[in-house]
Interface confidence: medium
């Protein structure tokens, strides 16, 4: 089993649609179960996010340049939700996403009809096959949702978007 998300980072506009792509190949002849999971950014400082002293965390980040303090932390330190699952042709949305225009298309791509304020974060594409357990069964993409901002007004296309005040 091999799962690949081609875009490691995706930027999309608030209240616009987007598609998070996911490809997989498998030796199984059984239908795969596709699940998309959302993980919010790590809200703590890097030391707290791994439950360690800041000195130890800093030495870890120096040794491992791939480690990102805002993406890599224990699930208990951030919000984790199932966005949608697909078995056969049946797509089921997670409780938090019910009522939203979200579906899984082209085998494993997550299609979101209208991006919302809290959609920024990490999205994991997880594939389960009953008789192909070897290989890589998940991959992730970081999604950043941008609204209409003066800072970018003359750098990005201007979309007519709204805001959800705190």
């Amino acid at each position: 089993l091999q799962v690949t998300v081609p875009d490691k980072k995706k930027v999309a506009m608030l209240f616009q649609p987007t598609v998070l792509r996911c490809h997989f190949s498998t030796s199984s002849h059984q239908p795969a179960v596709v699940q998309w999971k959302f993980k919010s950014y790590c809200q703590d400082r890097m030391g707290e996010s791994l439950g360690m002293s800041s000195t130890r965390a800093q030495s870890l980040s120096k040794r491992n340049l791939e480690w990102d303090p805002y993406l890599d932390c224990l699930d208990s330190r951030r919000t984790v939700r199932v966005v949608a699952s697909k078995q056969g042709s049946t797509v089921t949305l997670g409780d938090f996403y019910r009522g939203r225009e979200i579906t899984i298309v082209h085998d494993a791509d997550l299609q979101i009809g209208k991006l919302m304020w809290g959609d920024s974060g990490l999205y994991y594409c997880i594939i389960t096959t009953p008789d192909d357990l070897e290989g890589k069964n998940e991959d992730s993409v970081e999604l950043l949702v941008l609204g209409r901002t003066g800072l970018l007004a003359d750098l990005l296309p201007s979309f007519a978007v709204e805001i959800m005040p705190e």
């Epitope: 790590c42 805002y70 993406l71 949702v145 901002t149 003066g150 800072l151 709204e162 805001i163």
Partner: antibody, heavy 120, light 112 residues
Framework: QVQLVQSGAEVKKPGSSVKVSCKAS????????ISWVRQAPGQGLEWMGG????????NYAQKFQGRVTITADKSTSTAYMELSSLRSEDTAVYYC?????????????WGQGTLVTVSS | DIVMTQSPLSLPVTPGEPASISCRSS???????????LDWYLQKPGQSPQLLIY???NRASGVPDRFSGSGSGTDFTLKISRVEAEDVGVYYC?????????FGGGTKLEIR
């Protein structure tokens, strides 16, 4: 609670450059914009430019174009503002400010300020 | 560039009394999404500025409800329903519609 900690005061000669750092602790550096604002002695606030670290996109006020460079290092949650060809009128307190995306233009957290004195 | 004009320059107020600061922009700050790209900041003596109001009328987190922002297009007002001693400082309006982001000249609120 997010904190922005800036580097210390600097005294510079006219024609030289200064680089001020702004380190963010707490919160998520990935989902913020950082702006730099300066305040000359007894004067008001002046926006110099800003950056969205996750995109690496910076935007500068025309007044400072060619003299200012704003960068961000996501791995250390630190933003930098470098101002070159300094003149006496650049003497000011330089602030970094953080705005939360998806927007980012309203700055809910500010650094303590860095006084840059340009004098021969 | 959008020019921001504030008045008055100085505002002496008795504690417990209301206060009002006006801000005018050289072009409309109302965007097609229905929001006004106008923020208010307060800089207390010897401190960094702090956000009070964003997008015209939204109070920032932790800001007392005696502060309110109103207005649309080119004319905006910051109101303090009952001024307290801790409210002294310089108040700035700022437009966030387009770059360069620009500030008003500031209004100095002092206690009478």
């Amino acid at each position: 609670q997010v904190q922005l900690v800036q580097s210390g005061a600097e005294v510079k000669k006219p024609g030289s450059s200064v680089k001020v750092s702004c380190k963010a602790s707490g919160g998520t550096f990935s989902s913020y914009a950082i702006s730099w604002v300066r305040q000359a002695p007894g004067q008001g606030l002046e926006w110099m430019g800003g950056i969205i670290p996750i995109l690496g996109i910076a935007n500068y006020a025309q007044k400072f174009q060619g003299r200012v460079t704003i960068t961000a290092d996501k791995s250390t949650s630190t933003a930098y503002m470098e101002l070159s060809s300094l003149r006496s009128e650049d003497t000011a307190v330089y602030y970094c400010a953080r705005g939360r995306l998806p927007y980012g233009d309203f700055w809910d957290s500010w650094g303590q300020g860095t006084l840059v004195t340009v004098s021969s | 560039d959008i020019v921001m004009t504030q008045s008055p320059l100085s505002l002496p107020v008795t504690p417990g009394e209301p206060a009002s600061i006006s801000c005018r922009s050289s072009q409309s700050l109302l965007y097609s999404n229905g929001y006004n790209y106008l923020d208010w900041y307060l800089q207390k003596p010897g401190q960094s500025p702090q956000l009070l109001i964003y997008l015209g009328s939204n109070r920032a987190s932790g800001v007392p409800d005696r502060f309110s922002g109103s207005g649309s297009g080119t004319d905006f007002t910051l109101k303090i329903s009952r001024v307290e001693a801790e409210d002294v400082g310089v108040y700035y309006c700022m437009q966030a519609l387009q770059t360069p982001l620009t500030f008003g000249g500031g209004t100095k609120l002092e206690i009478r």
